[in-house]
Amino acid sequence: ETVHCDLQPVGPERGEVTYTTSQVSKGCVAQAPNAILEVHVLFLEFPTGPSQLELTLQASKQNGTWPREVLLVLSVNSSVFLHLQALGIPLHLAYNSSLVTFQEPPGVNTTELPSFPKTQILEWAAERGPITSAAELNDPQSILLRLGQAQGSLSFCMLEASQDMGRTLEWRPRTPALVRGCHLEGVAGHKEAHILRVLPGHSAGPRTVTVKVELSCAPGDLDAVLILQGPPYVSWLIDANHNMQIWTTGEYSFKIFPEKNIRGFKLPDTPQGLLGEARMLNASIVASFVELPLASIVSLHASSCGGRLQTSPAPIQTTPPKDTCSPELLMSLIQTKCADDAMTLVLKKELVAHLKCTITGLTFWDPSCEAEDRGDKFVLRSAYSSCGMQVSASMISNEAVVNILSSSSPQRKKVHCLNMDSLSFQLGLYLSPHFLQASNTIEPGQQSFVQVRVSPSVSEFLLQLDSCHLDLGPEGGTVELIQGRAAKGNCVSLLSPSPEGDPRFSFLLHFYTVPIPKTGTLSCTVALRPKTGSQDQEVHRTVFMRLNIISPDLSGCTSKG
């Protein structure tokens, strides 16, 4: 019989469901085991206006070493604030710098992505190495990309519609799922049902869906049933803050006893059938009814407590309410640019508006130096000789002072420019790990120790070693020592920095062929990166050092020739 229960959208204050899924509108995963570079491509579509995105890259150590280098190609259609986490991963990031703003310096190698259409972006990425994964995502709030996880049976990655990215990629859409509710006619009492229906995915491997249920009721006030229906290969791990009746397909277990599996039931796989099931279980209210793509984590927040169900009369706003202005985030958006003996601070209005901030003033430490309103941005510019600039041997410093409507006291942030004319970068070669006696000679088979320093030292900036190679001329070729801030090969080790923070590494050189070159050039690219602030202040320099090579040794490790 037809169950009379008119499902209507429920307001977000009554119930909200967020979820994490590996289903994508278009995607592919492939295995490229012998590739030098692991290439991942993300096409991200956002609604108009700036969005915030959390992007996490995770890698497991394989054979005790970090994975190969990774190229992540990020193609976005509108402005994005990106919070990137990629600790310890030798990452190269290709993105459009006019659309992507980092919430903090990314600390990875970056490349400007040409403004190509999708096809050419894929071709551009594939020129650099076999694509391990590619995906199109619509309005993601967060993305987790697991490296070295590709389980694809294909040896190449060809975008296809409605793909399951497996363990390689999981993401959380910004828009919560549509939650609907209704009254089951003719049923007395206050028992409520929460129905979650997970739709079949593209791949049919066994899956566990974690369901977190948070009901804001006093424990005694609740009489509820949780109905979980999904494809046969789905089992459920339930994490609920209330006791309730559980009715599921497949098997389920509880977070507190994860190893104890309980067999579920055969449930109907239509909305009508599931409403009938709720009625059969004596529920008078369907407090939430949600249909989702195959998900890995689902969170249900509801505050119905068997009380009166409130459905929203009109289509509801599906984005969660925005927070009030965050001064910390606002200050992190100030971009510092240093050129032509002047410091320029830029604050884009679009970003400010997105944070719901109202700015009443932007000045340097000297309040008479005020920002200009240039339509789409505030621009504050001053020569190094005015506006209270503090000039030291290595740096020009000031303070950005922002007055915002929601705060009685102004927000302050230190801003710096490097005095590049006064900075000098040196490469030092040492024959012992104590870094005491400098040398310009390396001996094959003997470890050499290298330190890079900048003087005078710059405490607000971090000196990092991006890449190093040894050029041994026409016979010896080039030996890559460091690439993407990671050691290349097992004869190179990154060492702890000096007490002053100078980067250090060691390497061991061997030759298998003769003649052995008598000289070589050690070439390192270093970066000074602000410890806080925007990545547009990064400074890169390449430092060279001529080396002599003595005494042959025809056994060993890094071979060239």
């Epitope: 492939a30 012998n34 590739a35 030098i36 570079l37 190509f116 259409p117 999708k118 096809t119 050419q120 894929l122 071709e123 551009w124 990425a125 594939a126 020129e127 650099r128 190495g129 076999p130 694509i131 190449f156 990655c157 060809m158 975008l159 080039t478």
Partner: antibody
Framework: EVQLEQSGPEVVKPGTSVKISCKTS????????LHWIKQNQGKSLEWIGG????????TYRQKFKDKATLTVDKSSSTAFMELRSLTSDDSAVYFC?????????????WGQGTTLTVSS | ENVLTQSPAIMSASLGEKVTMTCRAS?????VYWYQQKSDASPKLWIY???NLAPGVPARFSGSGSGNSYSLTISSMEGEDAATYYC?????????FGGGTKLEIK
Amino acid sequence: EVQLEQSGPEVVKPGTSVKISCKTSGYTITEHTLHWIKQNQGKSLEWIGGINFDNGGTTYRQKFKDKATLTVDKSSSTAFMELRSLTSDDSAVYFCARRAYYYGSAFDYWGQGTTLTVSS
Amino acid sequence: ENVLTQSPAIMSASLGEKVTMTCRASSSVNYVYWYQQKSDASPKLWIYYTSNLAPGVPARFSGSGSGNSYSLTISSMEGEDAATYYCQQFISFPYTFGGGTKLEIK
């Protein structure tokens, strides 16, 4: 089945122009760029440039920038290459080829070639 | 531009013989691609990403190399392998091809 069908041989006079075509079928044209390659008699291959069916965007090898113009007609899934100010150096076989990102962006399907003879 | 030099320009091999041809790049490249062309026919993609065989290519073919030096090897020459083989690179612009190695049957 993927097919790239090129127009027939051309014999033209020096100083004139010629437009050769490459009709594609068997695949979604917007998912691949289409490229043109020149092969001189008994010589190697020389990449001329490529075009995106999606937006008509082109990339050229510098030396062909003033020589070749690449265009597409989406409605007929056809790509064109116009060669102007022809000289005997332009006499060659011209191939169109599809690029496939999943094969490392290599040219995975080629047309049968169009022979161009420039002679007075 | 990155010049790809193939050697030898012409070679002949007996049926069943092992064949190796090389491709040297004037600047280091990450991968090379190989195409096979028979007379009066279009080139065919033969090997991509240095060592991956294109669909339909016999397993007797293999590719290897890195940096500036790459090679294509046929473990046991067969009659149908007689053709000209071109190497190509994509990483530096403009995309360039080698001059070709013509493989004939002895």
